[in-house]
Amino acid sequence: AGVFELQIHSFGPGPGPGAPRSPCSARLPCRLFFRVCLKPGLSEEAAESPCALGAALSARGPVYTEQPGAPAPDLPLPDGLLQVPFRDAWPGTFSFIIETWREELGDQIGGPAWSLLARVAGRRRLAAGGPWARDIQRAGAWELRFSYRARCEPPAVGTACTRLCRPRSAPSRCGPGLRPCAPLEDECEAPLVCRAGCSPEHGFCEQPGECRCLEGWTGPLCTVPVSTSSCLSPRGPSSATTGCLVPGPGPCDGNPCANGGSCSETPRSFECTCPRGFYGLRCEVSGVTCADGPCFNGGLCVGGADPDSAYICHCPPGFQGSNCEKRVDRCSLQPCRNGGLCLDLGHALRCRCRAGFAGPRCEHDLDDCAGRACANGGTCVEGGGAHRCSCALGFGGRDCRERADPCAARPCAHGGRCYAHFSGLVCACAPGYMGARCEFPVHPDGASALPAAPPGLRPGDPQRYL
């Protein structure tokens, strides 16, 4: 067991051109805070994957207001360290994500607003108990300077916090076979409970007599470094001579991940993907709960009030992400129906509807014909958000108010002549054609193509189109 400690030294514009504007202003004062997320191993993981080693939020920094016209300086920082406790052995290799958040203190609807300013990530090797390691990371135009270390919590000592120390029972020396605990020379190693010969640097045990290896080490006593370059299979146990992993039982056999964690094999060992609210190599440690205030942007934390349960953030409209940290482009979900225009006003979503549609999402098709009269015996037809009149013969236009010239469209085929008639139009067909629109040729034997001429009409007579 132990604690990972992170000390932020400065956060401000990086060197070079294109200095960022200050995130705060006289109109919008703000303050910073930081979040650190730790994961075991050197895996390149997405920012959203669980912080299996743990996570921590800093306190809020002092309120800062930009001086008009001044370049963005290093911004005032929160006091104190970010501390991430770990219950298991320190893995030696780890990945980190450090996020810089801005809390806007203007007159925000619903309380302060949070936004992510910068996120840096890295993969490091670190022995517990060592000195502070200094680091500089850049995210866009911002630069973050920080130091970190891992320290063991008594009675644990060693580079992995797996050796146990106890106060000396005698003032001058430790008991038989027990060494002084460097650097705590006034303490002694506790009696060994691991398997005899288990490497004190690279092995640890949770049960008497066992010897479990830290990442990168193998063998019954964890004394053989893993070399994957000449190995055929990523499974143990190890061949003591080459250090290669040879086929054997899989590290995920029996699922070592607690609390519903899912196990995945890695080239050297296994990794647990923990459900929200749990962390540790085997998901055995409960992590962030509602008491840590993990929900940003007005999100409500649901569940997790007791230390052993996970939390869920119910995000207000316009935000998403496991911590409500991401602003949603709500219009990208195309909520406005029937071709409505979407407007995201921040506090609400609005749809500007096309003619003929109404409702919050333009979901209501208005009765296009309501109150619309079609003149001269025309009938109203709904459709597409606009009314349309189907006009009686001899009339046209949007409302059937225009007297139509039925011959304007040249309706008579094959050279037939068109005559306007009070009830429509009449086609006088050219020789050899018949039909209402002169569309049918008359066959040489006198028989016409379908349809037959109506009784009382000879081919070539004018055909009245009623």
Epitope: Q108, I109, G110, G111, P112, A113, C290, A291, D292, G293, C295, F296, N297, G298, L300, C301, V302, G303, A305, H314, P316, P317, G318, P335, H347, A348, L349, R350, C351, P360, R361
Partner: antibody
Framework: QVQLQESGPGLVKPSETLSLTCTVS????????WTWIRQPPGKGLEWIGY???????NSNPSLKSRVTVSLDTSKSQFSLNLSSVTAADTAVYYC????????????WGQGTMVTVSS | EIVLTQSPGTLSLSPGERATLSCRAS???????LAWYQQKPGQAPRLLIY???SRATGIPDRFSGSGSGTDFTLTISRLEPEDFAAYYC?????????FGGGTKVEIK
Amino acid sequence: QVQLQESGPGLVKPSETLSLTCTVSGDSISNYYWTWIRQPPGKGLEWIGYIYYSGTTNSNPSLKSRVTVSLDTSKSQFSLNLSSVTAADTAVYYCARVFNRGFAFDIWGQGTMVTVSS
Amino acid sequence: EIVLTQSPGTLSLSPGERATLSCRASQRISNTYLAWYQQKPGQAPRLLIYGASSRATGIPDRFSGSGSGTDFTLTISRLEPEDFAAYYCQQYDTSPLTFGGGTKVEIK
């Protein structure tokens, strides 16, 4: 101007289900979370539960097994069902709109008194 | 759940005086997600303050909120006749959403 109006029976028999509806006018029901709160006579306020058009709901654990909150976007209404009522459920029931940047309640209905009695 | 305790239960003051109402949480409210409401007899509550210190739309500036963590305060700088009512605090940091028991501000 957003307005909320509660409706439902004012008298419910013990062991029956209390059913109330809140009609929202003046804004889209899809833009906000919507909630129910109650206040027994002469006492303080108690949150019952909320709903969002996406289907997200949450309710007070002290009532959870008895509470159902639902929403009908087409009618711009949301509803409360509280089953197995007793005299202790007698209260003024309020519907309210949830703030868009935090779960405070910025617009309230005028409230409806529900008495549980045989 | 977070239990909110309001004090005093009743505050007897005269118009023009300063009123200070307290709301104490049983555990830390992480994000200053605390609201204050005013309720007059026979009416629904009205939101006064959100985010511990921001006034809601249309609320006079004699109402102010402060505090963080577990201790929050609503101050009415000069009581007007219409301010005599019951006042409730509510936290919206962690579910279940909870209200305080209320403080009644009455005319002395």
